[in-house]
């Protein structure tokens, strides 16, 4: 905590400049006027302050703007952004993509995922939706940051924007996020031909339902194992051995490598061993011949 003292007359601050790097923490606290600091924030990042000193400046801004900083200040935070907590950022209203770019550049490569996620969230809220310009900014300055957004925020993406999303932007997306993005992607790419469609839809397939996966198996797409492993477990389990064979094409041999991993393991347990044997891969764990399968979940649903 910063002690309160009065400012010595010779230390009075009339502008934010490099002389302030020689001020002790309590001198900064006593002598820097918060309103002056806010008005001249554009100078701060060019001055070689220590983070210890930046903490004092942050404290002054927090006192001046207890409800959250205005965008005129946020835009010029520079390395002071590294001192912000998600709780600080949650108070902001950010609409400018220039502000977003500036702060993404500062936070690049640092352990700031929570702060960056909160910042992006504030931008989406401030702009009203996740529009093409915002997506373009995220993909350019923060690959993977799209997946830091909640499914609720992602639901504001118009399908027309989906084309701007690159495969690597979805690498860290979870199933709930892909559940939201997949139908949008399907709509966005619906007029494309088979092979072109598959290339475009592939990164989103972690959100695809069984019927869509079944449809793909009829189109000779030769899905790679990495994509197959990212499919929803519920989408894979109802597939027959023949459908999986058609879906994967020459990549079907990869099932042996993934035999112990979900969703392959769970899918194997659902298949008749006879059917699995037709693949000639030595997959084990299917339902033995002569066993009757009762799906009790259906009976419970009817009663």
């Amino acid at each position: 905590d910063v002690e309160r003292t009065t400012c010595p007359p010779e230390k009075e601050v009339h502008e934010i400049d490099e002389s302030l790097i020689f001020y002790k923490k309590r001198e900064l606290e006593a002598c820097v006027d918060a309103a002056l600091l806010a008005a001249q924030m554009d100078r701060v990042d060019a001055i070689p302050f220590t983070y210890e000193q930046l903490d004092v400046l942050k404290h002054k801004l927090d006192e001046l703007y207890p409800q959250g900083y205005p965008e005129s200040v946020i835009r010029h935070l520079g390395h002071l952004f590294l001192k912000m907590s998600p709780e600080d950022i949650r108070k902001w209203n950010v609409t400018s993509l220039e502000t977003l770019k500036a702060l993404l550049k500062v936070s690049k490569g640092h352990e700031m995922s929570a702060q960056v996620a909160t910042l992006i969230d504030r931008v989406v809220v401030g702009r009203g939706q996740l529009d093409k310009d915002t997506v373009d900014t995220l993909t350019a300055f923060c690959p993977g940051c799209l997946c830091s957004l909640s499914p609720e925020r992602l639901s504001s993406v118009p399908p027309s924007v989906i084309g701007a999303v690159r495969p690597q932007d979805l690498d860290t997306c979870g199933p709930r996020q892909l559940d939201v993005l997949y139908p949008k992607a399907r709509l966005a790419f619906q007029n494309m031909s088979g092979s072109e469609y598959f290339v475009k839809i592939r990164p989103f397939l972690g959100g695809a339902p069984t019927e869509d996966v079944k449809a793909l198996s009829q189109q000779n797409v030769s899905m790679d194992l990495a994509t197959f492993m990212k499919l929803r477990r519920e989408a894979v389990l109802p597939l027959t051995v023949a459908e999986v064979q058609k879906l994967l094409g020459p990549h079907v041999e990869g099932l042996k490598v993934e035999e112990q991993h979900s969703p392959v393991r769970d899918w194997i347990l659902k298949q008749r061993q006879d059917d699995l044997d037709t693949l000639g891969l030595g997959l084990q764990g299917g339902i033995p011949n002569g066993y009757l399968i009762l799906d009790l979940s259906v009976r419970e649903a009817l009663s």
């Epitope: 070689p48 220590t50 210890e52 390395h79």
Partner: nanobody, 116 residues
Framework: QVQLVESGGGVVQPGGSLRLSCATS????????MGWFRQAPGEQRELVAR???????MYADSVKGRFTISRDNSKNTVLLQMNSLKPEDTAVYYC??????????WGQGTQVTVSS
């Protein structure tokens, strides 16, 4: 994490000189160059001199014309030549820098005492 080790402190009479050295254990990626700071008993740490990444030097008014900061890149060291020392220069002297991630780093300090 890069270690900073200061040396060269000691007891000196007013008007005397000392040369402080700060050795770094590796390459430093600093946002604001390297600085020499000092802390007198009961006082907060203050910056005395700084050398920026581009070689620009900056000095506190109280030491201008008496202290000189320099860098020897081949030896990964930052030097502080202190001339015309005064009793009010008595303090523990630290070298330090700020990374690009939000952290300040300091050495363990070296004591400088100016006394007759």
């Amino acid at each position: 994490q890069v270690q900073l080790v200061e040396s060269g402190g000691g007891v000196v009479q007013p008007g005397g000189s000392l040369r402080l050295s700060c050795a770094t254990s590796g390459t430093i990626f600093s946002r604001n160059g390297m600085g020499w700071f000092r802390q007198a008993p009961g006082e907060q740490r203050e910056l005395v001199a700084r050398i920026l990444n581009d070689g620009t030097t900056m000095y506190a008014d109280s030491v201008k014309g008496r202290f000189t900061i320099s860098r020897d890149n081949s030896k990964n060291t930052v030097l502080l030549q202190m001339n015309s020392l005064k009793p009010e220069d008595t303090a523990v002297y630290y070298c330090g820098y700020s990374d690009y991630r939000g952290t300040d780093y300091w050495g363990q300090g070296t004591q400088v005492t100016v006394s007759s």
